[in-house]
C-alpha cells in the first residue's frame, strides 16, 4: 500500500533558530520515511533531507527573512512514493520569537509605568507589536493592552496610584501570526499621591431638650482608593449654615469623631493627609433638628443569591447617584460601634458576602439617599444572611375543647430564638392509636381551630415553627375531647 499523501503542512519559523514544519498523518501504520525539500533564497537554493517522523527542522541558514520559502514532503515506503502539494511560507508571517526580557519597570507620574524591554533575538528593525498584561497583586483578572509599532520602551497609563501591579509583556512581528510567550512577570508599585477623598457618614443621636445633639462622624477609605494608601491623619472642619464661624479639628488619628452640634443645620467636611498633601474634602450636611428630610426610595427588598445577600431598591428620582447602606444586628444595644456602613454609587443595589454577616441573626438594613451633600430619609428592612431552624418550637396551649373541636394557641417564638423569618406554623395532631394529621397556617396566625375530632378521645398535639431552613417542633401536649 502506498503511503498516505502528506497533508496539512504547517511551518513555524523560530526566529533566527530554525524553520520547523509538521504534517499529517502523524503516525503511519507501515514503515514510512520522508524526504523534505525546502526551496529558499527566492527560489534560487534547495535543501533536502530525510525525516523519519512527520516533523522536520530546517537549519537557520535556510531561513532568512524576508524570504518566501516553499516546502514539499515526499512520503515513501516499500510500495512507492507520494508527494505532498507544495506549500509556500512567507517567513516573517510565521515567525515566532522567544519571550522578551523586561529590563526595567519605572513608575513615572502618579498612575503610569514606563517599561523598558528587549527581545532575546535581534529583531533587525522588523516592525513589532507588543502586548502588555497587568493586574493588581490581589486580583486574578488580567487587563491586556496592545501597542502597535512598539519600540523597546512603552508607557502603561491609566493605572491607580500607589498600587502594586503584576505585569508581563509579549510581542510579535507586525506581520506575524504568532505571539511570543509572556515574559517573566514583574511586580511594581505606582507612585503615591495625595489620599483619595474619603467616604463620610454620620450617626445622629436624638436632640436633647435644648435642641443640641451628638453627631458621631464616621469615615473610611473609599472603595476605589489604592490598597496601599497610607494616611498620617485627618482634619475636620464644620460650621453652622447661618454662621461664618468655622471650627477646625486637626490631626485626628481615629476614623470616627463625636461632635456636639446645636439644633441648626451644619456642614461638615473631613480630609485625610499624607506626606504629599491632603485629599479633597468629603462633605456631609447635618440637617436642622426640625427639618423634614426627603423620601426618595419607593420600595426595597432583600434576597439571597448564593453566596451573596442582595438588597435592591427603587428610587423615585434618577438624580440620586449615591446611597449609604447601613446594616446592624437587630439585637445591638446601640448603633455605635455595632453599625456597619458603605457608600454605593451609580446603582440601586448592594451586595455583601453572606459569610461577612453573622448567620441566624436578624439585621436591620437601611438605605439613605444622598443628593449633593444632603442626606434623605432612609428606607429600612430586615434580613438574614443565613437562616437556620428555630432554636425552639412554639409554646403551645389547648383552649375551647369541645366534643369534636379544639383551639390550639401558641406564643410567638422570641426573636433571639427564631434563626430566620418564620414562614408558617404546622399544627400536628394525633388521636391515640390513630394516624398523624396536620394543618399549616401562615406566620401571622398564633392559633388554629381543629375540627372533625372524635368525641371522648385522647389527642397529642404539637406545633412546628418553620423558617426557610426547616422547622422545629414545640413540646407535645395532650388533651381529650368531651363526651
Amino acid at each position: 500500500v502506498l503511503p498516505t499523501k502528506p497533508e496539512n503542512i504547517s511551518c513555524v519559523f523560530y526566529f533566527d533558530r530554525n524553520l520547523t514544519c509538521t504534517w499529517r498523518p502523524e503516525k503511519e501504520t507501515n514503515d514510512t520515511s520522508y524526504i523534505v525539500t525546502l526551496t529558499y533564497s527566492y527560489g534560487k537554493s534547495n535543501y533536502s533531507d530525510n525525516a523519519t517522523e512527520a516533523s522536520y527542522s530546517f537549519p537557520r541558514s535556510c531561513a532568512m527573512p524576508p524570504d518566501i520559502c516553499s516546502v514539499e514532503v515526499q512520503a515513501q515506503n516499500g510500495d512507492g512514493k507520494v508527494k505532498s502539494d507544495i506549500t509556500y511560507w512567507h517567513l516573517i508571517s510565521i515567525a515566532k520569537t522567544e519571550p522578551p526580557i523586561i529590563l526595567s519597570v519605572n513608575p513615572i507620574c502618579n498612575r503610569m509605568f514606563q517599561i523598558q524591554w528587549k527581545p532575546r533575538e535581534k529583531t533587525r528593525g522588523f516592525p513589532l507589536v507588543c502586548m502588555l498584561r497587568f493586574r493588581t497583586v490581589n486580583s486574578s483578572h488580567w487587563t491586556e493592552v496592545n501597542f502597535e509599532n512598539c519600540k523597546q520602551v512603552c508607557n502603561l497609563t491609566g493605572l491607580q496610584a500607589f498600587t502594586e501591579y503584576v505585569l508581563a509583556l509579549r510581542f510579535r512581528f507586525n506581520d506575524s501570526r504568532y505571539w511570543s510567550k509572556w515574559s517573566k512577570e514583574e511586580t511594581r508599585v505606582t507612585m503615591e499621591e495625595v489620599p483619595h477623598v474619603l467616604d463620610l457618614w454620620r450617626i445622629l443621636e436624638p436632640a436633647d431638650m435644648n435642641g443640641d445633639r451628638k453627631v458621631r462622624l464616621l469615615w473610611k477609605k473609599a472603595r476605589g482608593a489604592p490598597v496601599l494608601e497610607k494616611t498620617f491623619g485627618y482634619h475636620i472642619q464644620y460650621f453652622a449654615e447661618n454662621s461664618t464661624n468655622l471650627t477646625e479639628i486637626n490631626n485626628i488619628t481615629t476614623q470616627q469623631y463625636e461632635l456636639l452640634l446645636m439644633s441648626q443645620a451644619h456642614s461638615v467636611s473631613v480630609t485625610s493627609f499624607n506626606s504629599l498633601g491632603k485629599s479633597q474634602e468629603a462633605i456631609l450636611r447635618i440637617p436642622d433638628v426640625h427639618e423634614k428630610t426627603f423620601q426618595y426610595i419607593k420600595s426595597m427588598k432583600a434576597y439571597i443569591a448564593e453566596p451573596l445577600l442582595v438588597v435592591n431598591w427603587q428610587s423615585s428620582i434618577p438624580a440620586v447617584d449615591t446611597w449609604i447602606v447601613e446594616w446592624l444586628p437587630e439585637a445591638a444595644m446601640s448603633k455605635f460601634p455595632a453599625l456597619s456602613w458603605e457608600s454605593v454609587s451609580q446603582v440601586t443595589n448592594w451586595t455583601i458576602e453572606q459569610d461577612k454577616l453573622k448567620p441566624f441573626t436578624c439585621y436591620n438594613i437601611s438605605v439613605y439617599p444622598v443628593l449633593g451633600h444632603r442626606v434623605g430619609e432612609p428606607y429600612s428592612i430586615q434580613a438574614y444572611a443565613k437562616e437556620g431552624t428555630p432554636l425552639k418550637g412554639p409554646e403551645t396551649r389547648v383552649e375551647n375543647i369541645g366534643l369534636r373541636t379544639a383551639t390550639i394557641t401558641w406564643k410567638e417564638i422570641p426573636k433571639s430564638a427564631r434563626n430566620g423569618f418564620i414562614n408558617n406554623y404546622t399544627v400536628f395532631y394525633q388521636a391515640e392509636g390513630g394516624k398523624e394529621l396536620s394543618k399549616t397556617v401562615n406566620s401571622h396566625a398564633l392559633q388554629c381551630d381543629l375540627e372533625s375530632l372524635t368525641r371522648r378521645t385522647s389527642y397529642t398535639v404539637w406545633v412546628m415553627a418553620s423558617t426557610r431552613a426547616g422547622g422545629t417542633n414545640g413540646v407535645r401536649i395532650n388533651f381529650k375531647t368531651l363526651s
Epitope: 533566527d16 533564497s41 524576508p66 533587525r124
Partner: antibody
Framework: SVEESGGRLVTPGTPLTLTCTVS????????MSWVRQAPGKGLEWIGI?????TTYSASWAKGRFTISKTSTTVDLKMTSLTTEDTATYFC?????????????WGPGTLVTVSS | AAVLTQTPSPVSAAVGGTVTINCQSS????????LSWFQQKPGQPPKLLIY???TLASGVPSRFKGSGSGTEFTLTISGVQCDDAATYYC???????????FGGGTEVVVK
Amino acid sequence: SVEESGGRLVTPGTPLTLTCTVSGFSLSNYAMSWVRQAPGKGLEWIGIITYGDTTYSASWAKGRFTISKTSTTVDLKMTSLTTEDTATYFCARSYGGYSLAISLWGPGTLVTVSS
Amino acid sequence: AAVLTQTPSPVSAAVGGTVTINCQSSQSVYMNNELSWFQQKPGQPPKLLIYYAATLASGVPSRFKGSGSGTEFTLTISGVQCDDAATYYCLGGYDDDADNAFGGGTEVVVK
C-alpha cells in the same frame, strides 16, 4: 552585481560619500554591508543596512559613518576623515535580509586621505 | 567591542594536507553561531566560504568545513590545493551589532 564608486583622494576633515550601485536583485530583499581594508591590513566591518532600512554600525564607526539607501543604491557618508581612514571600501550583499553571510562583493573603491 | 583572535598566522601546508584555523571570540556570538569565514586573495574582494559557523556557501568545495559554537570556531581545509593559498578571515556577529568585527586574518601558504 555590486559596484562601488566615489573613492578619491581627499584632505583630512573633508566629508565624502561613497555609492554602491546594485543590479540583478532588489535591495528590499537583502541586507547590504560596508567593509574596508587599509593597505596591507585586514578587513574591518563598518556597518549594515537591512532589507527593511534599519542600519547598524560598528561602535568605532558610529557618528562618523552613515549608511542609507535608495531603491538601487547604497550610500556610505563619511565625515571628519583622517589619514587612518585611507582604505579600499567594499560594498557587499548578504544572504537574506539581515545576515552577516556576505556573499556578493563589489571590487572595492579606494579612498586616500592625505594632506 | 568584541575581539576575534585568529591563530596561527601564517600557517603553511603541503598540497593534499590539512589546515586548521582557529577563531576565538572575546564573547559569545549571537545565537552561538553567527560566524562567517571568508577567503581573500591579493587584489580581490573577499569570498564567503562558511556562514552560521558550519554552513557551506553556495559553490564552495566541500573540503572547506566550519565548526564550533559560542566563542570557539574552527575552519578546516582538508586536501589542500594550491588555489587555497590566501588570507582567511572570520567575522562574528553579536547581540549588539555595534560589536560585530572581523578577526585579524590568517595567511595560508601552500607548499
